[in-house]
């Protein structure tokens, strides 16, 4: 027998649907109406036929009471080819819901998103996460999506983006955005970061995550942040192959005094990089290739320094490698 596509936990909290049949029974998803966190995986299906079954231009207010009764607070939609018009229709309807967090993953968005009608209400999300989402509209996708959201977005995460750079002139400011995560875009690089950090569009950023984004030096990142006017309190550069030395011809970069936490773990560093901020509350240099203890003059003034998992701390080990097991408090790097 075929397993049920949707499973609701016994507390009406989590509901997961995996639609893998070529002709899925979408009505099975109705058992998720009482769930708080809902995940719908569409098995790579093309949702184009849906457009024939729904009126994407219908006034969503007619569904307002039905949608308000949904308990869903967090929704994940994955693995499908979605016409932009259908996505917009869904966003318009969900604007009447209690939805706070939306995750889109492994989606191919086809066609262009229509402009927001004057009478339409934007979706009041606090968090939007995108992973491996491709858009037919190229660089203007963020601006097109943004118009369907209210301006209170606090967390934006964009991973495995096909176009991590945005059409900055079309993007409006994100006044409430405190966390921006561009991790897992290995092709981004420092130039791409400059293009992605649209100047003065992210005025409230406190946390910036750039794990595995092809960054090369902390100084290069500093320059990109300075150019964009972005002053995070916390910066995560872990899982990048960082160079410790700075190009002598590159201008010196002054880090923002707002920065108090810097993560440089898993960065392949053989020495403490030059050009770090003068003062930090937290500096994580764990799981690098430091063969000797850093000298005080190599380090910023720092309250909380993590050096676990470096060769100089582990007697008799060579460079740390994936899956190595270390004793005591030393993490497996």
């Amino acid at each position: 027998t075929t397993p049920e596509p949707c499973e609701l936990d016994d507390e009406d909290f989590r509901c997961v649907c995996n639609f893998s049949e070529p002709q899925p029974d979408w009505s099975e998803a109705f058992q998720c109406v009482s769930a708080v966190e809902v995940e719908i995986h569409a098995g790579g299906l093309n949702l184009e036929p849906f457009l024939k079954r729904v009126d994407a231009d219908a006034d969503p207010r007619q569904y307002a009471d039905t949608v308000k009764a949904l308990r869903v607070r967090r929704l994940t939609v994955g693995a499908a080819q979605v016409p932009a018009q259908l996505l917009v229709g869904a966003l318009r309807v969900l604007a009447y819901s209690r939805l706070k967090e939306l995750t889109l993953e492994d989606l191919k968005i086809t066609g262009t998103m229509p402009p927001l009608p004057l009478e339409a209400t934007g979706l009041a999300l606090s968090s939007l996460r995108l992973r491996n989402v491709s858009w037919a509209t190229g660089r203007s996708w963020l601006a097109e999506l943004q118009q369907w959201l209210k301006p209170g977005l606090k967390v934006l995460s964009i991973a495995q983006a096909h176009s991590p750079a945005f059409s900055c002139e079309q993007v409006r400011a994100f006044p409430a955005l405190t966390s921006l995560d561009l991790s897992d875009n290995p092709g981004l690089g420092e130039r791409g970061l400059m293009a992605a950090l649209c100047p003065h569009k992210f005025p409230a950023i406190q946390n910036l995550a750039l794990r595995n984004t092809g960054m090369e030096t902390p100084t290069g990142v500093c320059a990109a942040l300075a150019a964009a006017g972005v002053q995070p309190h916390s910066l995560d550069l872990s899982h990048n192959s960082l160079r410790a030395t700075v190009n002598p011809s590159a201008p010196r970069c002054m880090w923002s005094s707002a920065l108090n936490s810097l993560n440089l773990s898993f960065a392949g560093l053989e020495q403490v990089p030059k050009g770090l901020p003068a003062k930090l509350r937290v500096l994580d240099l764990s799981c690098n290739r430091l063969n000797r203890a850093p000298q005080p003059d190599e380090l910023p003034e720092v309250d909380n320094l993590t050096l676990d998992g470096n060769p100089f701390l582990v007697p008799g080990t060579a460079l740390p490698h994936e899956g190595s097991m270390n004793s005591g408090v030393v993490p497996a790097c």
Partner: antibody
């Protein structure tokens, strides 16, 4: 059978940060459900503080939101509460609880805010 | 926020009596076919214990003399035949919408 156990200091000074940890046994906090903090001032009723879900998503009571952080350590199967800028009004028994119909409770820990 | 108002605030009844506690919500706590209203019993110095979930479902291990009913905004907890061990404070709670809220409690004593 899921079991929850609160731990942390029983006395916190005014204006400081209250920190509590809940250790969960018999169930993984990443498999499903919401993992809540609820408090009860002496002789008073119950107040929901907030939760962290299996996915890491958080939801807080708006009356406390500016002072509350709930986080988790999945490697230890623990979740934690931090409540900043405490006053005497934050003196209460603090419970960690699983789910949104609160079927599984820790035994509670009394935190007194006093200088 | 959804306010829950319990009545009475306290009551005294004799062993064997049928006892009813009501809980009124400031707005509906229903989501489609379910009412997200639950009932708890708390004895002094102990954590609350879930008695009834989703308005009318008896939690495993709870004696069958406890029952719940109601929908939308009006709910009732009934003890069909009061026992000495039922002396406690009873709370209703809604989980339809955050912030999740409790009633102020009903203190039940034996005459």
């Amino acid at each position: 059978q899921v079991q929850l156990q609160e731990s942390g200091p029983g006395l916190v000074k005014p204006s400081q940060t209250l920190s509590l940890t809940c250790t969960v046994s018999g169930y993984s906090i990443t498999s499903d459900s919401a993992w809540n903090w609820i408090r009860q001032p002496p002789g008073k009723g119950l107040e929901w503080i907030g939760y962290i879900s299996y996915s890491g998503s958080t939801s807080y009571n708006p009356s406390l939101k500016s002072r509350v952080t709930i986080s988790r350590d999945t490697s230890k199967n623990q979740f934690s509460l931090k409540l900043s800028s405490v006053t005497a009004a934050d003196t209460a028994v603090y419970y960690c609880v699983r789910g949104l119909r609160f079927a599984y409770w820790g035994q509670g820990t009394l935190v007194t805010v006093s200088s | 926020d959804i306010q829950l108002t319990q009545s009475p605030s306290s009551l005294s009844a004799s062993v064997g009596d049928r006892v009813t506690i009501t809980c009124r919500a400031s707005e509906s706590v229903d989501s489609y076919v379910n009412s997200f209203l639950h009932w708890y019993q708390q004895k002094p110095g102990k954590a609350p214990k879930l008695l009834i979930y989703r308005a009318s479902n008896l939690q495993s291990g709870v004696p069958s003399r406890f029952s719940g009913s109601g929908s939308r905004t009006d709910f009732t907890l009934t003890i069909s035949s009061l026992q000495p061990e039922d002396v406690a404070t009873y709370y209703c709670q809604q989980s339809n919408e955050d912030p999740y809220t409790f009633g102020q409690g009903t203190k039940l004593e034996i005459k």
